[in-house]
């Protein structure tokens, strides 16, 4: 299709080489299409957009994204050629930074129903470059935590070194929706609720004599509880003896609850104690079986191919630890009579 009629937008992604970060492009279609396609949830049942040219498609993305090769080759379908770029409704998510993301990205409606639709497209010229080392050391992270129930703030990483007074006007989005209540380089939250969690995008305009660019940064905001003050507790095994059949295979499961910690390094190990010998057992990796805001339940199993007489003399010890402390639970095997 002819892209010469597409509206054009220039964006700059200055990524930090010190941290992982994502980037997002919005398909900023002309308003009638945009409201119908990308933000259906914002329309009340009585509100009807001025123009409804496209069919609602449940199983296909609402818009199609392409990348324009610099050598003039035909447009490339993003989904087929770029596995690190994810198409999601009306957004394009870049999972990894890098100058190789520099280029022109075009979006247009998936369903073309009228000649009007052919001109309905947006071309985004994206320039990607590493942030200069001169940038301040304390720039805000692209992953920010808000403590539930307290006050907090979300800072725009590309502007966090500037005072509010020198900061340009900022446009904020949360999960793709425009936030109109603030134009400053940080959002102040009076009381943090779970719904404050999400993907925030901050944009500001940078101009020189030749052209103007939208500088964009993406912040993943997580709402968290305070760090636990408790050591983990073992939920299973409950009993200190376990009835078993000799010669049969046996799996002993250790399940423990770890309270939330911002820096979470849970330890879960199985040991065998045999007289004055103690050693760590090589067992399958631990796995998380339930995760909530407040805690996480982790399980690790010890597997015996067949229970021997020797196993009856041993003690099997599950050991769990977090930054606060550790807990153990011992299990002795007893032959079923």
């Amino acid at each position: 299709f002819n892209i010469s009629g597409c509206s054009t937008k220039k964006l700059l992604w200055a990524y930090s080489t010190r941290s992982e970060e994502e980037f997002i492009l919005f398909c900023d279609l002309p308003e009638p299409q945009k409201s119908h396609f990308c933000h259906r949830s914002q329309l009340s049942p009585t509100q009807v957009p001025d123009h409804l040219p496209f069919t609602d498609s449940k199983d296909l993305p609402d818009v199609q994204w392409y990348r324009q090769p610099s050598n003039g080759d035909p447009l490339e379908d993003i989904r087929k050629s770029y596995p690190h770029i994810i198409q999601d409704k009306c957004t394009l998510r870049f999972l990894t930074p890098g100058v190789n993301n520099t280029g022109s990205y075009i979006c247009r409606p998936k369903m073309i129903k009228s000649p009007y639709d052919l001109a309905c497209c947006v071309k985004m010229i994206l320039e990607v470059k590493p942030q200069s080392n001169a940038s301040c050391e304390n720039s805000a992270s692209h992953k920010q935590d808000l403590l539930l129930g307290s006050t907090g703030s979300i800072s725009c990483p590309s502007l966090s070194c500037q005072s509010d007074a020198q900061s340009p006007e900022v446009t904020w989005y949360k999960n793709g929706k425009l936030l109109s209540m603030t134009r400053s380089n940080r959002i102040v939250v009076d009381e943090v609720y779970i719904y404050h969690q999400g993907t925030y995008v901050c944009d500001y305009t940078q101009s020189d004599t030749a052209s103007s660019w939208t500088v964009r940064a993406v912040v993943q905001v997580r709402t968290i509880v305070g760090d636990t003050k408790l050591k983990p507790d073992i939920l299973d095994p409950v009993e200190s003896t376990l009835e078993v059949e000799l010669g049969k295979p046996l799996t002993i499961s250790c399940k423990a609850r770890f309270g939330f910690e911002r820096v979470f390094n849970p330890v879960m190990k199985w040991y065998i104690k045999d007289a004055d010998l103690e050693w760590e057992v090589s067992v399958p990796e631990a796995k998380s079986i339930k995760s909530t805001l407040k805690d996480e339940i982790i399980e690790r199993n010890i597997i015996l191919e067949k229970v021997t007489q020797r196993d009856l003399r041993r003690t099997f010890v599950c050991f769990v630890q977090n930054s606060i402390g550790n807990t153990t639970q011992s299990v002795q095997l007893k032959e079923k009579r």
Partner: nanobody, 116 residues
């Protein structure tokens, strides 16, 4: 800080013998259990043999009768005598010391390759 340094690995033909040594330095205690684990390419880590300060031992079924573990408490050294080596014994052998639950030390490992 405990450091465990292994030596004695190498290339050996099936049926041959090797003796691995592990010297422990730092705050290692003669009360600590010591031993050997191994990790074959693409496999998980498995316990080969462990020994207590009093000389009690335990072996993996796959090495029983072929491997012998011993230790010199005065020198803080543990040995693994490996006889009748097989191709399936090919692995990185790591020295192990256990102080108490949650306090385990590991060496860098020494490669044993059994091949004709």
């Amino acid at each position: 800080e405990v450091q465990l340094v292994e030596s004695g690995g190498g290339l050996i033909q099936p049926g041959g013998s090797l003796r691995l040594s592990c010297a422990a330095s730092g705050s290692i205690s003669s009360r600590d259990t010591m031993g050997w684990y191994r990790q074959a390419p693409g496999k998980g880590r498995e316990m080969v043999s462990v020994i207590s300060s009093s000389g009690n031992t335990n072996y993996a079924d796959s090495v029983l009768g072929r491997f012998t573990i011993s230790r010199d408490n005065a020198k803080n050294t543990v040995y693994l005598q490996m006889n009748a080596l097989r191709a399936e014994d090919t692995a990185v052998y790591k020295c192990y010391a256990h102080r108490t639950y949650g306090v385990d030390y590991w060496g860098q490992g020494t490669l044993v390759t059994v091949s004709s």
